[in-house]
Interface confidence: low
């Protein structure tokens, strides 16, 4: 049975399509191609005479068609008007005609899309935003990407208008994007430039740094305040309830005990109209007890690697202090083999390894003073490995 096949079935505008013919009969006079689903002389594209190998254009010929000796028809530089059915008529030597109909679909090369938005400066937890992918075109699939990934499943994301519109319900600060839309048809795809949202939010509860509470008289007090906010928050400071200044940082040189009190940071976002405050207590004290130098002791100072364990103890007579340990200027513990116990007074290493050899010391401190022990040296030896088979290595 005579059949035709389109290569490809879906064609991009401006490209070419080949109408292939299968099972062409023997003993032929010739054949003709027609636009449409039936033989119609007014819609003949081309005829071909086998004997003369002559192709004759018909009324529907556009000059873009080429017929081949095997009856296949090539149409170049196709337009959307070329979409549809094509009929091949084969004239056999017995003058009995045979027909076959094929079809193809021409799609446009899609333009680069763009994203329009109904609100590019939404307020967190308050506004919704609708993105629309332009232009609207027929036979087109619309896809959306957030942060270069396809849309996550979320009750806050809604697609509508044939997926052309993406709505974010109740935006959050994490919804800044970028957002891209992609349009696709069977022959082409194109993605928009990225669009970002300027989500207005905050301020969150501010944090005051550093975290220190105790200061000595004569020191400089330098406090900094930060609250996550868009646009950035405006800051002001109050001491014991009295307004001081509208800056993010507060600096008081050469403090005295009179500077003790409640320090309040006030953060304000003029767009959201929200305010947040944080209060910090600062204590300036004359009392400056010198923390005594702690003593460090080891259960043994020379150990066998991968076999022995060792306990280091930090001793002090002071009260209300904290203890921390150091090894080669690094804070401990630094591995799972090291454990602190008894309020950090004891450091246990089990088992000891070669890399544990070196200098250890402890430090005792309170809010306004600290002191450290003399160092202690830990030596790690390894026994010679026994010979497995009596052979010397080499």
């Amino acid at each position: 049975q005579l059949t035709t096949e389109s290569m490809p079935f879906n064609v991009a505008e401006g490209k070419e399509v080949l109408l292939l013919v299968h099972n062409l009969p023997q003993q032929l006079f010739g054949y003709s191609w027609y636009k449409g689903e039936r033989v119609d002389g007014n819609r003949q594209i081309v005829g071909y005479a086998i004997g003369t190998q002559q192709a004759t254009p018909g009324p529907a010929n556009s000059g873009r068609e080429t017929i081949y000796p095997n009856a296949s028809l090539l149409i170049q530089n196709v337009t959307q008007n070329d979409t549809g059915f094509y009929t091949l008529q084969v004239i056999k030597s017995d003058l009995v005609n045979e027909e076959a109909t094929g079809q193809f679909h021409v799609y446009p090369e899609l333009p680069k899309p763009s994203i329009s938005s109904n609100n590019s400066n939404p307020v967190e937890d308050k506004d919704a935003v609708a993105f629309t992918c332009e232009p609207e075109t027929q036979d087109t699939t619309y896809l959306w990407w957030i942060n270069n990934q396809s849309l996550p499943v979320s009750p806050r994301l809604q697609l509508s208008n044939g997926n052309r519109t993406l709505t974010l319900l109740s935006v959050t600060r994490n919804d800044t994007g970028p957002y891209e839309c992609e349009i696709q048809n069977p022959v082409s795809a194109n993605r928009s430039d990225p669009v970002t949202l300027n989500v207005t939010y905050g301020p969150d509860t501010p944090t005051i740094s550093p975290s220190d509470t105790y200061y000595r008289p004569g020191a400089n007090l330098s406090l900094s305040c930060y609250a996550a906010s868009n646009p950035p928050a405006q800051y002001s400071w109050l001491i014991n309830g009295t307004f001081q200044q509208s800056t993010q940082e507060l600096f008081i040189p050469n403090i005295t005990v009179n500077n003790s009190g409640s320090y309040t940071c006030h953060a304000n976002n003029s767009v959201t109209g929200c305010n947040r405050t944080t209060v910090k207590t600062i204590i300036v004290t004359e009392l400056s007890p010198v923390v005594a130098k702690p003593q460090i002791k080891a259960s043994k100072t020379t150990v066998t690697g991968d076999k022995d364990s060792v306990n280091l103890t930090c001793s002090t007579n002071d009260t209300g202090i904290s203890i921390r340990w150091f090894f080669k200027n690094q804070s401990l513990p630094s591995s799972e083999r090291m454990k602190l116990s008894q309020g950090n007074t004891t450091l246990s290493i089990n088992p000891v390894k070669r890399e544990d050899a070196g200098t250890y010391w402890c430090e005792v401190f309170n809010p306004i003073s600290k002191n450290q022990s003399d160092p202690i040296m830990l030596n790690v030896n390894y026994n010679a490995l026994p010979q497995e088979n009596g052979l010397s290595p080499g």
Partner: antibody, heavy 120, light 113 residues
Framework: EVQLLESGGGLVQPGGSLRLSCAAS????????LYWVRQAPGKGLEWVAT????????SYADSVKGRFTISRDNSKNTLYLQMNSLRAEDTAMYYC?????????????WGQGTLVTVSS | DIVMTQSPDSLAVSLGERATINCKSS????????????LAWYQQKPGQPPKLLIY???TRESGVPDRFSGSGSGTDFTLTISSLQAEDVAVYYC?????????FGGGTKVEIK
């Protein structure tokens, strides 16, 4: 007699570019679909790209999409493969091939190949 | 994309014995327009380009000895060498030729036992 002769292979650094050519003779060049196929040393055959009779339709293997471009000059009876952003894994013998008949079909005729080596 | 899977990877057969190579496609290669299976088989000897043996799954290319035959339909195909000759030692590849996907199988090396 159908003949396909590839050229343009050689040594190139990763990230570099190379343009392969395939000169055809012995048949009506503009009537046939053409292909590039490659074979890494000691590995199997991998179809790389296809081009239609007029050059209006092209298709590529995922491994080269966006980096390689197939084209043809029917007036010169020559097929081309422009290879950009080359990687070590592009090292292979590159063959051009011709379809059996007018449409896209099995690869009836092959060239002898040209070797591309991507190495620093 | 269509994935073509060949088995076995290698095959050792005595001279004069039958060799059978299988090829499985991840989707049907049967073209409803002409009821033909769009599968080809190629033979490649060391240092040479591949040579077409069979197309449309079972149609032998002109000049190919009749000891080579192809069979199968849809997704499962077989190349059979009915009586292996010394000159048949080569790697054999199956290939989908459904436009625009021309994926090859991984190849089967045929040797003499």
């Amino acid at each position: 007699e159908v003949q396909l002769l590839e050229s343009g292979g050689g040594l190139v650094q990763p990230g570099g570019s190379l343009r392969l050519s395939c000169a055809a003779s012995g048949f009506s060049f503009s009537d046939y679909y053409l292909y590039w196929v490659r074979q890494a040393p000691g590995k199997g055959l991998e179809w790389v790209a296809t081009i239609s009779v007029g050059g209006g339709q092209t298709s590529y293997a995922d491994s080269v999409k966006g980096r390689f471009t197939i084209s043809r000059d029917n007036s010169k009876n020559t097929l081309y493969l422009q290879m950009n952003s080359l990687r070590a894994e592009d090292t292979a013998m590159y063959y051009c091939a011709r379809a059996m008949y007018y449409g896209p079909a099995w690869f009836a005729y092959w060239g002898q190949g040209t070797l591309v080596t991507v190495s620093s | 994309d269509i994935v073509m899977t060949q088995s076995p990877d290698s095959l050792a057969v005595s001279l004069g014995e039958r060799a059978t190579i299988n090829c499985k496609s991840s989707q049907s290669l049967l073209n409803s327009a002409n009821q033909k299976n769009y599968l080809a088989w190629y033979q490649q000897k060391p240092g040479q380009p591949p040579k077409l043996l069979i197309y449309f799954a079972s149609t032998r290319e002109s000049g190919v000895p009749d000891r080579f035959s192809g069979s199968g339909s849809g997704t499962d195909f077989t190349l059979t060498i009915s009586s292996l000759q010394a000159e048949d030692v080569a790697v054999y590849y199956c290939q989908s030729h459904i436009y625009p996907n021309f994926t090859f199988g991984g190849g089967t090396k045929v040797e003499i036992k």
